[in-house]
Amino acid sequence: MGVEGCTKCIKYLLFVFNFVFWLAGGVILGVALWLRHDPQTTNLLYLELGDKPAPNTFYVGIYILIAVGAVMMFVGFLGCYGAIQESQCLLGTFFTCLVILFACEVAAGIWGFVNKDQIAKDVKQFYDQALQQAVVDDDANNAKAVVKTFHETLDCCGSSTLTAITTSVLKNNLCPSGSNIISNLFKEDCHQKIDDLFSGKLYLIGIAAIVVAVIMIFEMILSMVLCCGIRNSSVY
């Protein structure tokens, strides 16, 4: 005998919620795997910036994305399948995973706040690396996409340490239309914008983290309520 009434509503709410979560995880994982195995991106591993070998920020970022996508798919599947099958075992596992993820998010939040300067530095390094790749290998469409995403999201273009060819390519191809360049500094320096994001706009990241945490708590409550509902319905 299945769950009824309000518990049934929770069951489908949990299903829909986790199906969306599973899909999002699939998209993240797909994009990350594409970036990881695409020949153009793989060139980043062998790219040299001037006389120095390129840092591996790009790859670290991709591996983090792969892990996030895989975990999202796994947790989403547990929630989805557990809810639709009314399986206490799967829902219990789902709840446990959420508790672990919640703990990880809190730990990551504390670590991120403590290491925000290093993270900002890594993000800038990632931007520089993608920019170098977009210029050196003019066929690297995903590197160009990364650069344009930075430019459009942060409303910036370039940095204060550009080579002549990079300036030319940026001006003619990769800057959002209407960007002005003053001397060697682009009007809106991406390095400066990244620094601003991690200092002045840190509260935005905090709000996003709180929203995610609230959703996780909400899902934990829903999964426990549904679990109890399933247990009670199986008694009668």
Epitope: E48, G50, D51, V135, V136, D137, D138, D139, S160, T161, L162, T163, A164, I165, T167, S168, V169, K171, N172, N173, I181, S183, N184, L185
Partner: antibody
């Protein structure tokens, strides 16, 4: 050894067209940006145009924009400069040069080919 | 009129030290773009002499040195030799003009 060999220069009337070629050898042509630089008789050097490794990015000096077109054939290791609507002031020795991304300059030059625009 | 200003001529006797200046502005040398130097021997193509303000490509004697300060750069040739007689050009990038710019060139004469 890096070698760049220009050809296609000559005498042309104002308003005429000419196509310069630059055969490259001794390096991986398809991985390098290439450029054209010219030098009017008895004058200094003037950058004309550049093209990226896969022809995605190009740029031109204002003095030649809309008249000159840079292109390349990576299978033939050859760089081209199509010059249309030629003017007397385009008279110069045209050098093909490799652009070094790492050093951000023109690190190897061809011997040049003379283009004379005169009636 | 060139964007980068160089003296039209310079001269020195063998063994002497000669300096060639290259003056730009805040949109090229002063903007942080590197300055490069090229040597053009009579009747030949230019050859890279100094890159990145002060670096020598392999094969260039250590008699040649470059430096940069503010909106200016300079090329110094010590222990001058007769084979140094050539035209010398400085080069940078101008962000306002969006072009690679060259100096007007300096004709170096080795006397005696």
């Amino acid at each position: 050894e890096v070698q760049l060999l220009e050809s296609g220069g000559g005498l042309v009337q104002p308003g005429g067209s000419l196509r310069l070629s630059c055969a490259a050898s001794g390096f991986t042509f398809r991985s390098n940006y290439m450029s054209w630089v010219r030098q009017a008789p008895g004058k200094g050097l003037e950058w004309v145009s550049y093209i990226s490794s896969s022809s995605t990015y190009t740029d031109y000096a204002d003095s030649v924009k809309g008249r000159f077109t840079i292109s390349r054939d990576n299978s033939k290791n050859t760089l081209y400069l199509q010059m249309n609507s030629l003017r007397a002031e385009d008279t110069a020795v045209y050098y093909c040069a490799r652009y070094s991304y790492g050093r951000d300059n023109f690190d190897y030059w061809g011997q040049g080919t003379l283009v004379t625009v005169s009636s | 009129q060139s964007v980068l200003t160089q003296p039209p001529s310079a001269s020195g006797t063998p063994g002497q030290r000669v300096t060639i200046s290259c003056t730009g502005s805040t949109s090229n040398i002063g903007a942080g773009y590197d300055t490069h130097w090229y040597q053009q021997l009579p009747g030949t193509a230019p050859k890279l002499l100094i890159y990145g303000n002060s670096n020598r490509p392999s094969g260039v004697p250590d008699r040649f040195s470059g430096s940069k300060s503010g909106t200016s750069a300079s090329l110094a040739i010590s222990g001058l030799r007769s084979e140094d007689e050539a035209d010398y050009y400085c080069q940078s990038y101008d962000t306002n003009l969006s072009v690679w710019v060259f100096g007007g060139g300096t004709k170096l004469t080795v006397l005696g």
